[in-house]
Structure formats: C-alpha cells, structure tokens
C-alpha cells in the first residue's frame, strides 16, 4: 500500500491532508519496510547476516553515512546542512538500489518499490531544501562504470555488497528519519 | 533475552557528581535503530526523561537538566554511562536505564532496568 | 517542547468493567505515541507503540488509538493485576515527554 492511503487514513475521513513532514515521514517508513523483506530474502539465502562487522568492514564500498560534521546529529544540528546531506546521500545511494534490481527472486517489485519510493522521497526532501545549489548529484558515468564494476563480482561478493547496501541504507534512513523529525 | 541493570551510590550528598551505569544483555548497542535511554521517578511523582544515546552515537538531553548531564556508552562492554553534577535534594528519584529498539524509531522503551533509587 | 496532558488523573473501577484514559499532545505527534503501565514498587512495562500497537505479550483487552494530537487507552475486561499508573509518551522528536500519569484503581 503506497504511503498516505494505509487502513488509518481511511479510517479517520475527519483527518487533515498530510503536511510535506507526515508525509516525508511516512515514506521513509514505507521504504523501511520495503528493505526489512528484501533483508529477509538475503538473510534466508545466505549467511551474510551473520558475517562480523570487521568482514563487512574490508569490502571498499563507498556508502553514505551519517557523520556528526553533517549537521544531522543533536550536537551540532543544522537543518539546512543536515537536509542537503540527506538529499546528496540517497542521491549516492541511487546507484546501489539499481544495482539491487537483479539481484531478488521472489522479493524482485519489492526492490523496485524501494527504488521508486526513494526518487519520490528525493523529490519530497528537494521540495523542502532551500539550498538547492549546495546537492552534488553523482556523475552518471562514474556511475556507470560502478555499476558495471559490482555486477562483475563474484557471487559471494555480490551477496556481501547486497547485504552491505541494505544494510547500510537502513541505517541511512534511520538517521534520516531521526533528524528529520527535530526540524 | 534482553536485559538491563543500572548501579551507582543510593546516597549522594549536596553538590557531589553522581555517576550511573546501565549494563546491559541480549542486544547491542552498535546495531541500527537502537538506543539506550535514562528515565527517573521522584517517589510518588511523574516519569521523567533524562538523557538517551544512539547506535552512532548521537545524544539527546533534556533541555532543563542539559548543562548538568553527560551520557557515554562502551559498546564492547555493553554499558551506557550518565553524570549528573552539582546533585540536589530534588533529584532524589528512583532512576531507570531503558532501551529503546525498532526499526521506525518510535522513541518507544521496550525493556527497563529495575531501577536503583539515588537520596 | 510538546507537553503531554492525562485525563483523568486517577479513576476507578470493578473487575471485568471497561476505561478509557486520555492523552493530549501540546502539538501533532502523528503516531508517535506509547503507552506505559506501572505498578508500585515495579518499572514501567510498555504496553502500547506508535499509538495503537500492542507489544508482544499484553493482553488483547487493550487496544491504544488516535493520531495526532488527541489518545485514548481502553482497557475492556479489568483484571486485578491492570491496577497501577498509566503514562502516555511523546515518542516523536526530543526532548522526550511523559504524562503526569493516570491512576487507576480496582
């Protein structure tokens, strides 16, 4: 069920149109329930999930993450800062979900749900960013080449980069989700 | 099973620092989503929220206690610490370590520490 | 910071009858509301998250609703063991807020 029109909403006809932060919010959440099955996938079919921190720690992907320097954490929060690292990292993370699209059996229009919800979210943040001009959209071309470069792991490799990307943007979105709602 | 056990002197006097720690089991502190929280009771009066620290180690603290609170964890120990300086007889209280843990952060404490009440 | 508001502040009742308690929020919280029970001498135990689900483990005789701004906790059926404290919780941003709590008694 795609955010806003759950059995809530419809239950409560009295209620106000979602603001632009309710409805952030619920996207996020809807997109965290999208990686929670595809997670469920990966973990069933491998045992990546098991693998320690320092192993998942060796693969060179370059995935964003919340620092404290991003403005998004309590000490040091900055709205405007912490909103474009926010944008500029699910951006990054673009290329990583495409890559994702191949890589589910029976989970496969989950993954595309969570890459679709993930451009709307994008297009919601950037509706609410003033800086605009400040978000680095990643070069096609690297890209590109990045992409190609996954895809060309073995499949150990290519199960522990899927399991790293989820991971990752789980966390991602958490923080996100954290930090946007004390704006 | 996840459990939590705070501990620290039941007396303190005027003035004096006082320093908690949770130890806790059954979950960690460096997985996404969670955070341990700290929660105290005066006796026969309201919860009130204290302090709370994340996975990542962002932290929060109540805005009228802020300047005297101080929130740290040990992951490989699984502990989360607080400071409390310049201690007064209104914070006599029975003081709760909690953990907070689901994916949406709901900001909701799942499991609670028995508590250790601090005069 | 958004202040939580319980009514009523203490209420009783017999075994098997059915309450409602109230939790106001100063602003809109959406869902992000939870719900505590404690008993004297105990620490709290969560028993409703994100305004309306149950934790693992609490019995179906309560049920947690609303959104927004306005709550309400309904425990149908008391039972003995449901006497104590009950503390609503703004679970949307920091600083988080506690109720001032409703007493009820059996």
């Known amino acids: 069920v795609p955010p806003g029109e759950d059995s809530k909403d419809v239950a409560a006809p009295h209620r106000q149109p979602l603001t632009s932060s309710e409805r952030i919010d619920k996207q996020i959440r809807y997109i965290l329930d999208g990686i929670s099955a595809l997670r469920k996938e990966t973990c069933n079919k491998s045992n990546m999930c098991e693998s320690s921190k320092e192993a998942l720690a060796e693969n060179n992907l370059n995935l964003p993450k919340m620092a404290e320097k991003d403005g998004c954490f309590q000490s040091g929060f900055n709205e405007e800062t912490c909103l474009v690292k926010i944008i500029t990292g699910l951006l990054e993370f673009e290329v990583y979900l495409e890559y994702l699209q191949n890589r589910f059996e029976s989970s496969e229009e989950q993954a595309r749900a969570v890459q679709m919800s993930t451009k709307v979210l994008i297009q919601f943040l950037q509706k609410k960013a003033k800086n605009l001009d400040a978000i680095t959209t990643p070069d096609p071309t690297t890209n590109a080449s990045l992409l190609t470069k996954l895809q060309a792991q073995n499949q150990w490799l290519q199960d522990m980069t899927t399991h790293l990307i989820l991971r990752s943007f789980k966390e991602f979105l958490q923080s996100s989700l954290r930090a946007l709602r004390q704006m | 099973q996840v459990t939590l056990k705070e501990s620290g002197p039941t007396l303190v006097k005027p003035t004096q620092t006082l320093t908690l720690t949770c130890s806790f089991s059954?979950?960690?502190?460096?997985?996404?989503?969670?955070?341990v929280g700290w929660v105290r009771q005066p006796p026969g009066k309201a919860l009130e929220w204290l302090a709370f620290?994340?996975?990542?180690?962002?932290?929060y603290y109540s805005p009228s206690l802020e300047s005297r609170l101080t929130i740290t964890k040990d992951t490989s120990k699984n502990q989360v610490v607080l400071t409390m300086t310049n201690m007064d007889p209104v914070d006599t209280a029975t003081y709760y370590c909690?953990?907070?843990?689901?994916?949406?952060?709901?900001?909701?404490?799942?499991?609670w520490g028995q508590g250790t009440l601090v005069t | 910071d958004i202040q939580m508001t319980q009514s009523p502040s203490s209420l009783s009742a017999f075994v098997g009858d059915g309450v409602t308690m109230t939790c106001w929020a100063s602003?809109?919280?959406?869902?992000?509301l939870n719900w505590y029970h404690q008993r004297p001498g105990e620490a709290p135990e969560l028993l409703v998250f994100a305004a309306s689900n149950l934790q693992i483990g609490v019995p179906s005789r309560f049920r947690g609703s609303g959104s927004e701004t306005y709550f309400t906790l309904t425990i149908n059926s008391l039972q003995p063991e449901d006497s104590g404290t009950y503390f609503c919780?703004?679970?949307?941003?920091?600083?988080?807020?506690f109720g001032g709590g409703t007493k009820l008694e059996i």
């Open positions: 059954g979950f960690s502190l460096s997985t996404s989503g969670v955070g």
């Open positions: 919780q703004n679970g949307h941003s920091f600083p988080l807020t």
């Open positions: 620290i994340w996975w990542d180690d962002d932290k």
């Open positions: 602003q809109s919280i959406n869902d992000y």
């Open positions: 909690a953990r907070s843990a689901d994916d949406y952060l709901y900001y909701s404490f799942d499991t």
